[in-house]
């Protein structure tokens, strides 16, 4: 089978010097010596499929998957990962081998999976499969913390079943809303597992280890606050513990709190109460509702009632499996060059998602913000007005979600030209996609007004660079125009740009660019 190309697959492990992080390149960075991954032909597969040895990577490590192709002529390629196409830029090394690279910076769970590389050479088409997983570093895990009541004490214990043993801290805040942001002076952190002061406004427990940091908020209903006008909703998976705190303040001790599930009082053993006097001698009461391991029938409206306050409810929904609910239809946007614009995804998910925004093989951090109606939103504004395809990817323990966005930037065409002995071609990336005209410059037409219509072939969007369409126009050489200057012009609603080409001149072609607004 001598037609098949000689293929070498290698893994390059990068020393994580942070200067390289964030760069997406087809060239290797500072690295250890490459490790050969074998790349054997997969038997009994439809089509030509090479399979590289499985790659195990440490969390946060940076690697390059690289393929060296010893095959004559040009090659084109495409990477596919989790149903998303990623651009591929082959180059040639000193031995004239085609080199295709995929750089993975700061490896995360999200980036683990199968990477497929499709290569098209002049002789044949073939596929190379890489399987990348996170090294099972002593089964490192980081689980979201949960609460338990301390035996015989009015206190909560925060537990995170993680490896290595995590550092557990309580994050407490006594003000409302924005001022409870992590780095705010109103926030107090206590690095301990047990918490006795349970009267605060906002109580969270966080666990952190080598894998990062996970937090759980103590779900609270405050009877002194106006309720959210959309009923608060709490999701839990079967078997997880349920904790809801009801809090109320009154001028004196003459009030009581009760919990009901769907208008039936909670059974004893599923709640406990604490009370204290605040600095201004008002009485604060809190009543916890808890279920150590929820079942489907714990779903429903939990209502906290008081003899002196309006009651408030939360809808607790018990699910078998986590989920991510959002519309995954792709969205196209068209903006001006200086217009402020952010992509946004609105979703409902449980457990909380981990997410990334990706553009041109580069991943960007993803921030999530909770909305009042139980939904969350992630926005991405850092596109720097670069047109192309942007990908939002989210996952939690049970579900994955990907959404594609295309950003088009309205701008005047910019023309690049190239020519060969038989034809001249012009390319433009303006948007809306430009239309083309070719003109001949001669003694009769020194201003190049004589239009050429014969032998012109326009191709709209023949090359997709990270989702950015490029339009081209080709003029086939004829005796009538040999030796003449010709002008190709691309125009759209924002302007015109032209390039002048001398046809059939020896040596490098002189190009003269002229822009017309």
């Amino acid at each position: 089978n001598q037609d098949l190309p000689v293929i070498k697959c290698v893994l390059i492990n990068h020393k994580n010097n942070d200067s390289s992080v964030g760069k997406s390149s087809s060239y290797p960075m500072v690295s250890e010596s490459p490790e050969d991954l074998g790349c054997a032909l997969r038997p009994q597969s439809s089509g030509t499929v090479y399979e590289a040895a499985a790659v195990e990577v440490d969390v946060s490590a940076s690697i390059t998957l690289q393929v060296l192709v010893d095959a004559p002529g040009n090659i084109s390629c495409l990477w596919v990962f989790k149903h998303s196409s990623l651009n591929c830029q082959p180059h040639f090394d000193l031995q004239n081998r085609g080199v295709v690279s995929m750089v993975i910076l700061k490896m995360t769970e999200t980036q683990a999976g199968e990477y497929l590389l499709f290569i098209q050479s002049e002789a044949t088409n073939y596929t190379i499969l890489f399987t990348v997983s996170i090294r099972n570093t002593l089964l490192y895990t980081l689980r979201r913390p949960y609460f338990r009541k301390m035996e015989n004490q009015d206190a909560l214990v925060c537990i995170s079943e993680s490896v290595p043993e995590p550092i557990v801290e309580w994050v407490l805040c006594d003000s409302q809303g924005e001022s409870c942001k992590e780095e705010s002076p109103a926030v107090v952190k206590k690095e301990e597992k047990v918490l006795h002061e349970l009267f605060g406004t906002d109580i969270r427990c966080c666990a952190r280890n080598e894998l990062g940091r996970e937090c759980t908020r103590l779900f609270t209903i405050d009877l002194n606050q106006t309720p959210q006008t959309t009923l608060p909703q709490l999701f839990l998976k079967v078997g997880e513990p349920l904790w809801i705190r009801c809090k109320a303040v009154h001028v004196n001790h003459g009030f009581g709190l009760t919990w009901e599930l769907e208008n039936k009082a909670l059974e004893e053993g599923n709640y406990f109460e604490m009370s204290t006097y605040s600095t201004n001698r008002t009485m604060i009461r809190i009543l916890f509702a808890f279920v150590s391991s929820v079942a489907r029938n714990d779903t429903g409206y939990y209502t906290c009632s008081s003899s002196k306050h309006p009651s408030q409810s939360a809808l607790v929904t018990i699910v078998e499996k986590g989920f991510i609910n959002a519309t995954n239809s792709s969205e196209d946007y068209e903006i001006d060059q200086y217009e402020e614009f952010c992509f946004s995804v609105r979703f409902k998910a449980y457990p909380q998602i981990r997410c990334t925004w990706t553009f041109s093989r580069k991943s960007f951090p993803c921030e999530q913000k909770g909305l009042d109606n139980g939904y969350s939103i992630s926005k991405f504004c850092n596109h720097k007005h670069q047109p192309g395809e942007y990908i939002f990817h989210a996952e939690n323990d049970d579900a994955q979600f990907t959404k594609m966005f295309t950003l088009n930037i309205r701008r005047k065409p910019q023309v690049l030209a190239e020519a060969s002995a038989s034809q001249a071609s012009c390319f433009s990336d303006g948007y809306p996609l430009p239309s083309w005209t070719w003109k001949k410059c001669s003694d009769k037409s020194p201003n190049c007004t004589e239009e050429i219509t014969e032998g012109v072939w326009n191709r709209k969007a023949n090359r997709k660079v990270f989702g950015q369409w490029v339009s081209s126009s080709t003029l086939n050489m004829s005796e009538a125009i040999k030796g003449f200057l010709v002008k190709c012009c691309a125009y759209n609603s924002l302007g015109t740009s032209c390039e002048t080409i001398l046809l059939n001149s020896p040596g490098p072609f002189p190009f003269i660019q002229d822009n017309i607004s």
Partner: antibody, heavy 121, light 113 residues
């Protein structure tokens, strides 16, 4: 029995403010939310906002944000609605309405008799 | 905001006959998994404040005659007066309390034919 008694009719000039009161009796005042709803002459009903009589915190419809303030006085079991920068479109009957709370927050079992506010130059 | 629409704008029904009013919301006002529908119906007579008839789309308020019934779920709801009486002449409003701002339908005027 439950009663919500509102203050009398008011005539105001454009740009002025009006403060309507609603005195509750026949139930524990702090146990139920109070809403304000208005109705322009011959028109439908429009929700303005909600106040928690226990804590005093309030939430307003976006349309009225910055112009409306809802307050309460627990010693007299009274809620107040003040609307500023009045314009002719604010001519309406203003109702206070009690809310059951809990999962049902948002529908109204008892209403005041209404206060007609006329804005005219 | 959730927009509520009602049909018809008005209707005239003979005494003792059935009157049906429809209400539609611009998005679902049903809260799964309990599938409760956040919809209330009110009756308003001239010069009076509205009176609560139905909540949770189909639960009758105490003291409301059983000729009034509510049905529907999701986005489509109906108020039915099974046997119209003279004292039922009024304007009827539907209202969603699923999310803020709480919004009312434009009203349906019921008269006797």
């Amino acid at each position: 029995q439950v009663q919500l008694v509102q203050s009398g009719a008011e005539v105001k000039k454009p740009g002025a403010s009006v403060k309507v009161s609603c005195k509750a009796s026949g139930y524990t005042f702090t146990r139920y939310y109070m809403h304000w709803v208005r109705q322009a002459p011959g028109q439908g009903l429009e929700w303005m906002g909600i106040i928690n009589p226990s804590g005093g915190s309030a939430s307003y419809a976006q349309k009225f944000q910055g112009r409306v303030t809802m307050t309460r006085d627990t010693s007299t079991s009274t809620v107040y609605m003040e609307l500023s920068s009045l314009r002719s479109e604010d001519t309406a009957v203003y109702y206070c309405a009690r809310d059951l709370g809990g999962a049902a927050a948002g529908y109204f079992d008892y209403w005041g008799q209404g206060t007609l506010v006329t804005v005219s130059s | 905001d959730i927009v509520m629409t009602q049909s018809p704008d008005s209707l005239a029904v003979s005494l003792g006959e059935r009157a049906t009013i429809n209400c539609k919301s611009s998005q679902s006002i049903s809260h799964s998994p309990n599938t409760r529908d956040y919809l209330a119906w009110y009756q308003q007579k001239p010069g009076q404040p509205p009176k609560l008839l139905i909540y949770w789309a189909s639960t009758r308020e105490s003291g409301v005659p059983d000729r009034f019934s509510g049905s529907g779920s999701g986005t489509d709801f109906t108020l039915t007066i099974s046997s119209l009486q003279a004292e039922d002449v009024a304007v009827y409003y539907c209202q969603q309390y699923y999310s803020s701002p709480f919004t009312f339908g434009p009203g349906t005027k019921v008269d006797i034919k």
